[in-house]
Amino acid sequence: MRTEAQVPALQPPEPGLEGAMGHRTLVLPWVLLTLCVTAGTPEVWVQVRMEATELSSFTIRCGFLGSGSISLVTVSWGGPNGAGGTTLAVLHPERGIRQWAPARQARWETQSSISLILEGSGASSPCANTTFCCKFASFPEGSWEACGSLPPSSDPGLSAPPTPAPILRADLAGILGVSGVLLFGCVYLLHLLRRHKHRPAPRLQPSRTSPQAPRARAWAPSQASQAALHVPYATINTSCRPATLDTAHPHGGPSWWASLPTHAAHRPQGPAAWASTPIPARGSFVSVENGLYAQAGERPPHTGPGLTLFPDPRGPRAMEGPLGVR
Protein backbone atom coordinates (compact mmCIF):
# COMPACT_ATOMS: atom_id res chain seq x y z
CA MET A 1 0.00 0.00 0.00
CA ARG A 2 1.22 3.52 -0.56
CA THR A 3 -0.18 6.96 -0.09
CA GLU A 4 -0.14 9.23 -3.08
CA ALA A 5 -0.61 12.95 -2.90
CA GLN A 6 -3.36 14.10 -5.18
CA VAL A 7 -3.06 17.55 -6.63
CA PRO A 8 -6.22 19.47 -5.80
CA ALA A 9 -8.07 21.52 -8.37
CA LEU A 10 -6.39 24.90 -8.73
CA GLN A 11 -8.38 27.58 -7.05
CA PRO A 12 -8.08 31.14 -8.37
CA PRO A 13 -6.35 33.44 -5.91
CA GLU A 14 -8.48 35.96 -4.15
CA PRO A 15 -8.63 39.27 -6.01
CA GLY A 16 -6.39 41.90 -4.57
CA LEU A 17 -2.72 42.78 -4.50
CA GLU A 18 -1.37 40.40 -7.10
CA GLY A 19 -3.40 41.23 -10.21
CA ALA A 20 -2.48 39.64 -13.55
CA MET A 21 1.14 39.19 -12.55
CA GLY A 22 0.08 37.34 -9.42
CA HIS A 23 -1.99 34.93 -11.47
CA ARG A 24 1.07 33.96 -13.47
CA THR A 25 3.35 33.52 -10.49
CA LEU A 26 0.79 31.40 -8.69
CA VAL A 27 -0.12 29.17 -11.63
CA LEU A 28 3.51 28.30 -12.37
CA PRO A 29 4.25 26.82 -8.93
CA TRP A 30 1.19 24.60 -9.15
CA VAL A 31 2.10 23.41 -12.62
CA LEU A 32 5.57 22.61 -11.32
CA LEU A 33 4.14 20.95 -8.24
CA THR A 34 1.92 18.79 -10.43
CA LEU A 35 4.99 17.75 -12.41
CA CYS A 36 6.89 17.00 -9.21
CA VAL A 37 4.09 14.85 -7.85
CA THR A 38 3.66 12.85 -11.08
CA ALA A 39 7.36 12.62 -11.88
CA GLY A 40 7.70 9.01 -10.74
CA THR A 41 4.74 7.74 -12.75
CA PRO A 42 5.44 4.46 -14.56
CA GLU A 43 4.92 3.94 -18.27
CA VAL A 44 4.40 1.12 -20.72
CA TRP A 45 6.07 1.01 -24.12
CA VAL A 46 4.92 -1.03 -27.10
CA GLN A 47 6.79 -1.87 -30.28
CA VAL A 48 5.19 -3.59 -33.26
CA ARG A 49 7.32 -4.92 -36.10
CA MET A 50 6.48 -6.83 -39.26
CA GLU A 51 9.06 -9.47 -40.13
CA ALA A 52 10.80 -8.94 -43.48
CA THR A 53 10.95 -12.68 -44.10
CA GLU A 54 7.28 -13.43 -43.49
CA LEU A 55 5.11 -10.51 -44.56
CA SER A 56 2.21 -11.40 -42.31
CA SER A 57 4.29 -12.29 -39.28
CA PHE A 58 4.47 -9.76 -36.47
CA THR A 59 6.66 -9.31 -33.43
CA ILE A 60 5.21 -7.33 -30.55
CA ARG A 61 7.44 -6.14 -27.74
CA CYS A 62 6.19 -4.47 -24.59
CA GLY A 63 7.89 -3.20 -21.50
CA PHE A 64 7.02 -1.67 -18.16
CA LEU A 65 8.99 1.30 -16.88
CA GLY A 66 8.11 1.33 -13.23
CA SER A 67 9.36 0.20 -9.88
CA GLY A 68 6.49 -2.05 -8.78
CA SER A 69 6.34 -5.81 -9.02
CA ILE A 70 4.59 -7.11 -12.13
CA SER A 71 1.75 -9.47 -11.31
CA LEU A 72 0.57 -10.23 -14.84
CA VAL A 73 0.90 -9.13 -18.47
CA THR A 74 -1.86 -9.47 -21.04
CA VAL A 75 -1.35 -8.94 -24.77
CA SER A 76 -4.42 -8.37 -26.90
CA TRP A 77 -5.26 -7.14 -30.36
CA GLY A 78 -8.06 -5.13 -31.89
CA GLY A 79 -8.20 -2.73 -28.96
CA PRO A 80 -7.53 -2.48 -25.25
CA ASN A 81 -8.16 -5.59 -23.22
CA GLY A 82 -11.72 -5.71 -21.98
CA ALA A 83 -12.82 -3.08 -24.50
CA GLY A 84 -13.31 -5.17 -27.59
CA GLY A 85 -9.80 -6.57 -27.75
CA THR A 86 -9.05 -10.26 -28.12
CA THR A 87 -6.49 -11.84 -25.82
CA LEU A 88 -3.42 -13.27 -27.50
CA ALA A 89 -1.33 -14.16 -24.47
CA VAL A 90 -1.25 -13.93 -20.70
CA LEU A 91 2.09 -14.05 -18.89
CA HIS A 92 2.68 -14.58 -15.18
CA PRO A 93 6.21 -13.99 -13.89
CA GLU A 94 6.37 -17.40 -12.21
CA ARG A 95 3.40 -19.52 -13.24
CA GLY A 96 4.08 -19.36 -16.94
CA ILE A 97 2.48 -18.31 -20.18
CA ARG A 98 -0.82 -18.97 -21.89
CA GLN A 99 -1.17 -18.10 -25.56
CA TRP A 100 -3.86 -18.48 -28.20
CA ALA A 101 -3.69 -18.60 -32.00
CA PRO A 102 -2.36 -16.80 -33.90
CA ALA A 103 0.22 -16.22 -31.15
CA ARG A 104 3.19 -18.46 -31.91
CA GLN A 105 5.63 -17.66 -29.12
CA ALA A 106 5.20 -15.44 -26.10
CA ARG A 107 8.11 -15.04 -23.72
CA TRP A 108 9.67 -12.84 -21.07
CA GLU A 109 12.63 -10.89 -22.41
CA THR A 110 13.53 -9.29 -19.08
CA GLN A 111 11.79 -9.05 -15.73
CA SER A 112 9.80 -6.12 -17.05
CA SER A 113 9.47 -6.73 -20.79
CA ILE A 114 7.91 -9.39 -22.98
CA SER A 115 7.80 -10.31 -26.65
CA LEU A 116 5.20 -12.08 -28.72
CA ILE A 117 5.55 -13.53 -32.21
CA LEU A 118 2.36 -13.87 -34.22
CA GLU A 119 1.84 -16.58 -36.83
CA GLY A 120 1.27 -15.12 -40.25
CA SER A 121 -0.85 -17.57 -42.16
CA GLY A 122 -4.49 -18.13 -42.93
CA ALA A 123 -7.59 -16.35 -41.72
CA SER A 124 -6.16 -15.68 -38.31
CA SER A 125 -3.16 -13.71 -39.52
CA PRO A 126 -2.84 -10.09 -38.43
CA CYS A 127 -2.72 -7.24 -40.90
CA ALA A 128 -0.84 -3.97 -41.01
CA ASN A 129 -3.50 -1.78 -39.43
CA THR A 130 -4.09 -4.09 -36.47
CA THR A 131 -3.62 -2.52 -33.08
CA PHE A 132 -1.83 -4.50 -30.37
CA CYS A 133 -2.16 -3.68 -26.70
CA CYS A 134 -0.16 -4.70 -23.65
CA LYS A 135 -1.50 -4.43 -20.14
CA PHE A 136 0.82 -4.66 -17.16
CA ALA A 137 -0.75 -5.33 -13.79
CA SER A 138 1.72 -4.02 -11.25
CA PHE A 139 1.61 -3.50 -7.52
CA PRO A 140 1.24 -0.90 -6.14
CA GLU A 141 0.96 1.11 -9.36
CA GLY A 142 -2.15 -0.58 -10.67
CA SER A 143 -2.99 -1.59 -14.25
CA TRP A 144 -1.20 0.14 -17.10
CA GLU A 145 -2.02 -0.45 -20.72
CA ALA A 146 -0.35 0.72 -23.91
CA CYS A 147 -1.25 0.11 -27.55
CA GLY A 148 0.71 0.27 -30.78
CA SER A 149 0.28 -0.50 -34.45
CA LEU A 150 2.23 -0.38 -37.67
CA PRO A 151 1.92 2.77 -39.77
CA PRO A 152 -0.12 2.06 -42.93
CA SER A 153 2.77 2.68 -45.32
CA SER A 154 5.55 0.86 -43.48
CA ASP A 155 8.02 -1.34 -45.31
CA PRO A 156 8.38 -4.87 -43.92
CA GLY A 157 11.24 -5.14 -41.49
CA LEU A 158 11.76 -1.37 -41.45
CA SER A 159 8.69 -0.26 -39.54
CA ALA A 160 10.49 -0.22 -36.25
CA PRO A 161 14.01 -0.90 -35.04
CA PRO A 162 14.84 -4.57 -34.42
CA THR A 163 15.17 -4.00 -30.67
CA PRO A 164 13.33 -1.81 -28.21
CA ALA A 165 16.60 -0.08 -27.35
CA PRO A 166 15.82 3.13 -29.30
CA ILE A 167 12.49 3.36 -27.51
CA LEU A 168 14.19 2.81 -24.21
CA ARG A 169 16.86 5.31 -25.13
CA ALA A 170 14.22 7.86 -26.01
CA ASP A 171 12.49 7.17 -22.73
CA LEU A 172 15.73 7.41 -20.79
CA ALA A 173 16.69 10.59 -22.57
CA GLY A 174 13.25 11.93 -21.81
CA ILE A 175 13.50 10.83 -18.21
CA LEU A 176 16.94 12.42 -17.81
CA GLY A 177 15.90 15.60 -19.58
CA VAL A 178 12.65 15.88 -17.69
CA SER A 179 14.43 15.04 -14.45
CA GLY A 180 16.76 17.99 -14.98
CA VAL A 181 13.88 20.30 -15.72
CA LEU A 182 11.94 18.94 -12.77
CA LEU A 183 14.88 19.29 -10.43
CA PHE A 184 15.28 22.89 -11.49
CA GLY A 185 11.52 23.38 -11.33
CA CYS A 186 11.22 21.89 -7.87
CA VAL A 187 14.07 24.06 -6.57
CA TYR A 188 12.42 27.09 -8.15
CA LEU A 189 9.11 26.02 -6.67
CA LEU A 190 10.60 25.79 -3.19
CA HIS A 191 12.09 29.23 -3.72
CA LEU A 192 8.68 30.61 -4.74
CA LEU A 193 6.91 28.90 -1.87
CA ARG A 194 9.43 30.35 0.57
CA ARG A 195 8.79 33.82 -0.85
CA HIS A 196 5.04 33.32 -0.56
CA LYS A 197 5.03 31.52 2.78
CA HIS A 198 2.84 34.19 4.37
CA ARG A 199 0.05 33.22 1.96
CA PRO A 200 -1.88 30.03 2.96
CA ALA A 201 -1.48 27.48 0.17
CA PRO A 202 -4.15 24.90 -0.67
CA ARG A 203 -3.37 21.62 1.06
CA LEU A 204 -2.62 18.40 -0.77
CA GLN A 205 -5.20 15.79 0.09
CA PRO A 206 -3.48 12.46 0.56
CA SER A 207 -5.53 9.43 -0.38
CA ARG A 208 -4.85 5.75 -0.10
CA THR A 209 -4.78 4.33 -3.58
CA SER A 210 -3.81 0.84 -4.56
CA PRO A 211 -4.99 -1.92 -6.84
CA GLN A 212 -7.27 -2.87 -3.97
CA ALA A 213 -9.32 0.32 -4.09
CA PRO A 214 -13.05 -0.51 -3.89
CA ARG A 215 -14.72 -1.37 -7.14
CA ALA A 216 -18.36 -1.56 -8.07
CA ARG A 217 -19.20 -4.97 -9.46
CA ALA A 218 -22.24 -6.19 -11.28
CA TRP A 219 -22.28 -9.93 -10.69
CA ALA A 220 -24.12 -12.44 -12.80
CA PRO A 221 -23.82 -15.73 -10.91
CA SER A 222 -26.11 -17.74 -13.13
CA GLN A 223 -23.92 -16.98 -16.10
CA ALA A 224 -20.73 -17.57 -14.21
CA SER A 225 -21.76 -21.00 -13.04
CA GLN A 226 -21.58 -22.31 -16.59
CA ALA A 227 -18.95 -20.00 -18.04
CA ALA A 228 -15.82 -21.54 -19.49
CA LEU A 229 -12.65 -20.39 -17.77
CA HIS A 230 -10.34 -21.15 -20.64
CA VAL A 231 -10.59 -20.50 -24.36
CA PRO A 232 -8.11 -22.71 -26.18
CA TYR A 233 -8.25 -20.72 -29.39
CA ALA A 234 -9.73 -17.65 -30.96
CA THR A 235 -11.07 -17.46 -34.49
CA ILE A 236 -10.06 -14.17 -36.06
CA ASN A 237 -11.73 -12.96 -39.22
CA THR A 238 -9.79 -11.53 -42.13
CA SER A 239 -11.06 -7.99 -41.76
CA CYS A 240 -8.63 -7.54 -38.88
CA ARG A 241 -11.33 -6.73 -36.38
CA PRO A 242 -11.28 -8.76 -33.18
CA ALA A 243 -13.42 -11.84 -33.52
CA THR A 244 -15.78 -13.27 -30.98
CA LEU A 245 -14.28 -16.00 -28.84
CA ASP A 246 -16.25 -19.18 -29.32
CA THR A 247 -16.34 -21.44 -26.30
CA ALA A 248 -19.19 -23.77 -27.16
CA HIS A 249 -20.93 -22.98 -23.89
CA PRO A 250 -24.52 -21.80 -24.01
CA HIS A 251 -24.48 -19.31 -21.15
CA GLY A 252 -22.89 -15.99 -22.08
CA GLY A 253 -19.90 -14.55 -20.33
CA PRO A 254 -18.64 -14.78 -16.82
CA SER A 255 -19.74 -12.62 -13.96
CA TRP A 256 -16.76 -10.31 -14.17
CA TRP A 257 -17.35 -9.54 -17.83
CA ALA A 258 -20.30 -7.57 -16.54
CA SER A 259 -18.19 -5.89 -13.91
CA LEU A 260 -18.51 -2.14 -14.05
CA PRO A 261 -16.15 0.57 -12.93
CA THR A 262 -17.43 2.96 -10.29
CA HIS A 263 -17.97 5.86 -12.67
CA ALA A 264 -19.49 5.51 -16.11
CA ALA A 265 -17.09 8.15 -17.37
CA HIS A 266 -14.21 5.79 -16.69
CA ARG A 267 -15.49 2.87 -18.67
CA PRO A 268 -13.04 1.62 -21.28
CA GLN A 269 -13.96 2.54 -24.82
CA GLY A 270 -16.23 0.09 -26.61
CA PRO A 271 -15.35 -1.42 -29.98
CA ALA A 272 -17.10 1.35 -31.90
CA ALA A 273 -15.25 4.10 -30.09
CA TRP A 274 -12.05 2.15 -30.53
CA ALA A 275 -12.56 1.78 -34.28
CA SER A 276 -12.76 5.54 -34.69
CA THR A 277 -9.68 6.27 -32.58
CA PRO A 278 -6.97 7.73 -34.79
CA ILE A 279 -3.70 5.81 -34.50
CA PRO A 280 -0.55 7.87 -34.76
CA ALA A 281 1.48 6.93 -37.82
CA ARG A 282 4.35 5.43 -35.90
CA GLY A 283 5.60 1.89 -35.50
CA SER A 284 5.67 2.21 -31.75
CA PHE A 285 4.14 4.55 -29.28
CA VAL A 286 3.61 4.80 -25.59
CA SER A 287 0.14 5.16 -24.18
CA VAL A 288 -0.59 4.85 -20.52
CA GLU A 289 -3.35 5.02 -17.98
CA ASN A 290 -3.36 3.92 -14.44
CA GLY A 291 -6.61 2.65 -13.02
CA LEU A 292 -5.69 4.28 -9.75
CA TYR A 293 -5.77 7.76 -11.25
CA ALA A 294 -9.03 7.08 -13.02
CA GLN A 295 -10.55 5.76 -9.83
CA ALA A 296 -9.54 8.78 -7.85
CA GLY A 297 -11.14 10.98 -10.47
CA GLU A 298 -7.79 12.53 -11.23
CA ARG A 299 -6.52 13.41 -14.66
CA PRO A 300 -4.04 10.84 -15.96
CA PRO A 301 -0.50 12.09 -15.50
CA HIS A 302 0.70 11.76 -19.09
CA THR A 303 -1.32 13.21 -21.91
CA GLY A 304 -0.31 14.88 -25.09
CA PRO A 305 -0.03 14.43 -28.82
CA GLY A 306 0.39 10.83 -29.90
CA LEU A 307 -0.76 9.43 -26.58
CA THR A 308 -4.03 7.56 -26.45
CA LEU A 309 -5.39 6.79 -23.02
CA PHE A 310 -7.42 3.74 -22.08
CA PRO A 311 -8.74 3.95 -18.54
CA ASP A 312 -9.15 0.60 -16.83
CA PRO A 313 -9.91 1.01 -13.16
CA ARG A 314 -10.80 -2.65 -12.82
CA GLY A 315 -7.36 -4.21 -12.45
CA PRO A 316 -6.56 -7.68 -13.75
CA ARG A 317 -10.12 -8.96 -13.42
CA ALA A 318 -10.91 -7.03 -16.56
CA MET A 319 -8.50 -9.17 -18.49
CA GLU A 320 -10.27 -11.14 -21.12
CA GLY A 321 -9.35 -14.74 -21.51
CA PRO A 322 -10.58 -18.13 -20.49
CA LEU A 323 -13.52 -16.83 -18.55
CA GLY A 324 -13.58 -13.48 -20.26
CA VAL A 325 -15.83 -14.44 -23.10
CA ARG A 326 -18.93 -12.76 -24.33
Epitope: S71, P93, A137, L229, M319
Partner: antibody, heavy 122, light 107 residues
Protein backbone atom coordinates in the same frame (compact mmCIF):
# COMPACT_ATOMS: atom_id res chain seq x y z
CA UNK B 1 10.93 -20.74 0.99
CA UNK B 2 7.30 -20.16 0.05
CA UNK B 3 5.11 -20.79 3.07
CA UNK B 4 1.53 -20.30 4.21
CA UNK B 5 0.93 -20.41 7.95
CA UNK B 6 -2.64 -20.61 9.24
CA UNK B 7 -4.18 -19.68 12.58
CA UNK B 8 -5.01 -22.29 15.21
CA UNK B 9 -8.00 -24.59 15.66
CA UNK B 10 -11.37 -23.09 16.59
CA UNK B 11 -14.41 -24.46 18.38
CA UNK B 12 -17.62 -22.56 17.70
CA UNK B 13 -21.30 -22.83 18.48
CA UNK B 14 -23.91 -23.02 15.72
CA UNK B 15 -24.86 -19.55 14.48
CA UNK B 16 -21.49 -18.04 15.44
CA UNK B 17 -18.77 -16.78 13.09
CA UNK B 18 -15.17 -17.81 12.60
CA UNK B 19 -12.29 -15.94 11.00
CA UNK B 20 -9.27 -17.93 9.87
CA UNK B 21 -6.01 -16.24 8.91
CA UNK B 22 -3.31 -17.32 6.47
CA UNK B 23 0.06 -15.56 6.57
CA UNK B 24 2.17 -15.81 3.43
CA UNK B 25 5.93 -15.54 3.21
CA UNK B 26 8.73 -16.24 0.74
CA UNK B 27 7.08 -14.69 -2.34
CA UNK B 28 5.54 -11.49 -3.69
CA UNK B 29 2.12 -11.65 -2.08
CA UNK B 30 0.44 -9.35 -4.62
CA UNK B 31 1.54 -11.44 -7.61
CA UNK B 32 -0.78 -14.24 -6.57
CA UNK B 33 -4.19 -15.01 -5.13
CA UNK B 34 -5.32 -17.17 -2.23
CA UNK B 35 -7.88 -19.94 -2.53
CA UNK B 36 -9.60 -21.57 0.41
CA UNK B 37 -10.49 -25.27 0.38
CA UNK B 38 -12.20 -27.26 3.12
CA UNK B 39 -12.24 -30.94 3.99
CA UNK B 40 -14.86 -32.44 6.28
CA UNK B 41 -13.65 -35.35 8.45
CA UNK B 42 -13.03 -38.40 6.24
CA UNK B 43 -14.30 -36.58 3.15
CA UNK B 44 -12.83 -35.13 -0.04
CA UNK B 45 -11.75 -31.60 -0.89
CA UNK B 46 -14.28 -28.81 -1.45
CA UNK B 47 -13.35 -25.44 -2.96
CA UNK B 48 -14.64 -22.55 -0.84
CA UNK B 49 -13.51 -19.49 -2.76
CA UNK B 50 -10.69 -17.34 -4.08
CA UNK B 51 -9.37 -13.83 -3.54
CA UNK B 52 -6.83 -11.93 -5.60
CA UNK B 53 -4.09 -10.47 -3.43
CA UNK B 54 -3.51 -8.03 -6.28
CA UNK B 55 -6.87 -6.28 -6.47
CA UNK B 56 -9.01 -8.00 -3.80
CA UNK B 57 -11.52 -9.36 -6.30
CA UNK B 58 -13.25 -12.48 -5.02
CA UNK B 59 -15.07 -15.57 -6.22
CA UNK B 60 -17.04 -17.80 -3.87
CA UNK B 61 -18.62 -21.21 -4.10
CA UNK B 62 -22.35 -20.94 -4.69
CA UNK B 63 -23.06 -23.07 -1.63
CA UNK B 64 -21.31 -20.64 0.72
CA UNK B 65 -22.09 -17.38 -1.09
CA UNK B 66 -23.59 -14.94 1.40
CA UNK B 67 -22.00 -16.58 4.42
CA UNK B 68 -18.34 -16.34 3.48
CA UNK B 69 -16.14 -13.27 3.13
CA UNK B 70 -12.52 -13.27 2.05
CA UNK B 71 -10.13 -10.38 2.56
CA UNK B 72 -6.41 -9.69 2.33
CA UNK B 73 -4.02 -7.34 4.08
CA UNK B 74 -1.14 -6.60 1.73
CA UNK B 75 0.83 -4.79 4.41
CA UNK B 76 1.15 -8.03 6.40
CA UNK B 77 0.81 -10.49 3.48
CA UNK B 78 -2.13 -12.12 5.22
CA UNK B 79 -5.38 -13.52 3.83
CA UNK B 80 -8.51 -13.99 5.92
CA UNK B 81 -11.61 -16.12 5.51
CA UNK B 82 -14.66 -15.41 7.63
CA UNK B 83 -17.58 -17.82 7.72
CA UNK B 84 -20.79 -16.69 9.38
CA UNK B 85 -23.93 -18.45 10.65
CA UNK B 86 -21.98 -21.62 11.30
CA UNK B 87 -23.70 -24.99 11.08
CA UNK B 88 -22.53 -28.41 12.20
CA UNK B 89 -21.86 -29.36 8.58
CA UNK B 90 -19.25 -26.59 8.39
CA UNK B 91 -17.03 -28.66 10.69
CA UNK B 92 -13.92 -29.23 8.58
CA UNK B 93 -10.26 -28.53 8.16
CA UNK B 94 -9.96 -25.24 6.23
CA UNK B 95 -6.90 -24.87 4.03
CA UNK B 96 -5.55 -21.79 2.32
CA UNK B 97 -3.49 -22.28 -0.82
CA UNK B 98 -1.63 -19.96 -3.15
CA UNK B 99 -3.42 -19.47 -6.46
CA UNK B 100 -3.39 -16.91 -9.24
CA UNK B 101 -3.88 -13.12 -9.20
CA UNK B 102 -6.66 -13.61 -11.74
CA UNK B 103 -9.26 -16.33 -11.49
CA UNK B 104 -9.16 -17.25 -15.16
CA UNK B 105 -5.56 -18.37 -15.52
CA UNK B 106 -2.83 -20.26 -13.63
CA UNK B 107 -5.16 -21.04 -10.75
CA UNK B 108 -3.67 -24.29 -9.46
CA UNK B 109 -2.96 -24.45 -5.73
CA UNK B 110 0.65 -24.53 -4.59
CA UNK B 111 1.67 -24.50 -1.81
CA UNK B 112 -1.00 -25.14 0.83
CA UNK B 113 -1.25 -23.99 4.42
CA UNK B 114 -1.16 -26.60 7.20
CA UNK B 115 -4.92 -26.35 7.70
CA UNK B 116 -7.16 -25.02 10.48
CA UNK B 117 -9.68 -27.31 12.11
CA UNK B 118 -12.99 -25.54 12.70
CA UNK B 119 -15.38 -27.51 14.89
CA UNK B 120 -19.00 -26.40 15.09
CA UNK B 121 -20.74 -27.99 18.03
CA UNK B 122 -23.38 -27.02 20.55
CA UNK C 1 -20.79 -27.25 -12.30
CA UNK C 2 -18.28 -29.72 -13.71
CA UNK C 3 -18.29 -33.09 -12.00
CA UNK C 4 -15.01 -34.99 -11.84
CA UNK C 5 -15.23 -38.75 -11.41
CA UNK C 6 -12.12 -40.54 -10.22
CA UNK C 7 -11.58 -44.24 -10.64
CA UNK C 8 -10.91 -46.57 -9.09
CA UNK C 9 -11.91 -45.40 -5.62
CA UNK C 10 -9.17 -47.61 -4.15
CA UNK C 11 -6.09 -49.04 -5.83
CA UNK C 12 -4.20 -51.82 -4.03
CA UNK C 13 -0.64 -52.19 -5.29
CA UNK C 14 2.81 -53.18 -4.13
CA UNK C 15 5.91 -50.97 -4.10
CA UNK C 16 7.62 -51.00 -7.49
CA UNK C 17 4.35 -51.53 -9.37
CA UNK C 18 2.86 -49.07 -11.85
CA UNK C 19 -0.20 -47.08 -10.75
CA UNK C 20 -2.69 -45.67 -13.23
CA UNK C 21 -5.33 -43.29 -11.86
CA UNK C 22 -8.19 -41.97 -13.95
CA UNK C 23 -10.15 -38.74 -13.79
CA UNK C 24 -13.14 -38.09 -16.04
CA UNK C 25 -14.84 -34.69 -16.42
CA UNK C 26 -18.56 -34.28 -17.12
CA UNK C 27 -17.64 -31.85 -19.91
CA UNK C 28 -14.46 -30.70 -21.59
CA UNK C 29 -11.94 -28.87 -19.43
CA UNK C 30 -9.33 -28.63 -22.22
CA UNK C 31 -5.98 -29.35 -20.55
CA UNK C 32 -6.75 -27.35 -17.42
CA UNK C 33 -6.52 -30.09 -14.84
CA UNK C 34 -4.31 -30.51 -11.76
CA UNK C 35 -3.44 -33.51 -9.57
CA UNK C 36 -2.76 -33.40 -5.83
CA UNK C 37 -1.45 -35.93 -3.35
CA UNK C 38 -2.65 -36.00 0.26
CA UNK C 39 -1.25 -38.11 3.07
CA UNK C 40 -3.15 -38.66 6.35
CA UNK C 41 -3.02 -35.61 8.63
CA UNK C 42 -1.27 -33.49 5.99
CA UNK C 43 -2.29 -30.78 3.56
CA UNK C 44 -2.56 -31.70 -0.13
CA UNK C 45 0.49 -31.22 -2.35
CA UNK C 46 0.46 -30.20 -6.00
CA UNK C 47 1.87 -32.88 -8.33
CA UNK C 48 0.74 -31.94 -11.84
CA UNK C 49 -0.81 -28.81 -13.38
CA UNK C 50 -2.21 -28.17 -16.85
CA UNK C 51 -2.70 -31.91 -17.29
CA UNK C 52 0.95 -32.85 -17.84
CA UNK C 53 3.32 -30.33 -16.21
CA UNK C 54 5.14 -31.58 -13.14
CA UNK C 55 5.23 -29.13 -10.24
CA UNK C 56 8.57 -28.06 -8.75
CA UNK C 57 10.26 -30.81 -6.79
CA UNK C 58 7.98 -33.61 -7.97
CA UNK C 59 9.85 -36.80 -8.96
CA UNK C 60 9.88 -37.89 -12.60
CA UNK C 61 7.99 -41.09 -11.77
CA UNK C 62 4.81 -38.96 -11.63
CA UNK C 63 3.35 -38.08 -15.01
CA UNK C 64 0.04 -36.73 -16.21
CA UNK C 65 -1.72 -36.96 -19.55
CA UNK C 66 -5.03 -36.33 -21.24
CA UNK C 67 -7.19 -33.47 -22.46
CA UNK C 68 -10.86 -32.74 -22.90
CA UNK C 69 -12.69 -35.09 -20.57
CA UNK C 70 -10.29 -37.97 -19.88
CA UNK C 71 -7.15 -37.63 -17.78
CA UNK C 72 -4.62 -40.02 -16.31
CA UNK C 73 -2.07 -39.78 -13.52
CA UNK C 74 0.64 -42.42 -13.78
CA UNK C 75 3.15 -43.38 -11.12
CA UNK C 76 5.68 -45.47 -13.03
CA UNK C 77 7.12 -47.32 -10.05
CA UNK C 78 5.50 -46.92 -6.63
CA UNK C 79 7.71 -45.88 -3.75
CA UNK C 80 6.62 -46.46 -0.13
CA UNK C 81 5.94 -42.71 0.30
CA UNK C 82 3.55 -42.68 -2.68
CA UNK C 83 0.77 -44.50 -0.83
CA UNK C 84 -1.76 -41.75 -0.28
CA UNK C 85 -5.00 -40.26 -1.61
CA UNK C 86 -4.86 -38.53 -5.01
CA UNK C 87 -7.29 -35.82 -6.13
CA UNK C 88 -7.83 -34.25 -9.54
CA UNK C 89 -9.07 -30.67 -9.87
CA UNK C 90 -10.40 -28.84 -12.92
CA UNK C 91 -9.34 -25.22 -13.49
CA UNK C 92 -11.46 -24.64 -16.56
CA UNK C 93 -14.91 -23.70 -15.31
CA UNK C 94 -16.38 -21.85 -12.36
CA UNK C 95 -16.67 -23.15 -9.73
CA UNK C 96 -13.34 -24.94 -9.43
CA UNK C 97 -14.10 -28.55 -8.51
CA UNK C 98 -12.25 -31.62 -7.20
CA UNK C 99 -12.74 -35.30 -7.90
CA UNK C 100 -13.72 -37.62 -5.07
CA UNK C 101 -10.21 -39.02 -4.77
CA UNK C 102 -8.41 -42.30 -5.37
CA UNK C 103 -6.75 -44.04 -2.45
CA UNK C 104 -3.55 -45.88 -3.37
CA UNK C 105 -2.91 -48.44 -0.66
CA UNK C 106 -0.29 -51.10 -0.07
CA UNK C 107 -1.42 -54.53 -1.23
Amino acid sequence: QVQLVQSGAEVKKPGASVKVSCKASGYTFTSYGISWVRQAPGQGLEWVGWISSYDASTKYSQELQGRVTMTTDTSTSTAYMELRSLRSEDTAVYYCARGSPIYEHFNWFDPWGQGTLVTVSS
Amino acid sequence: EIVLTQSPATLSLSPGERATLSCRASQSVSSYLAWYQQKPGQAPRLLIYDSSNRATGIPARFSGSGSGTDFTLTISSLEPEDFAVYYCQQLSHHPLTFGGGTKVEIK
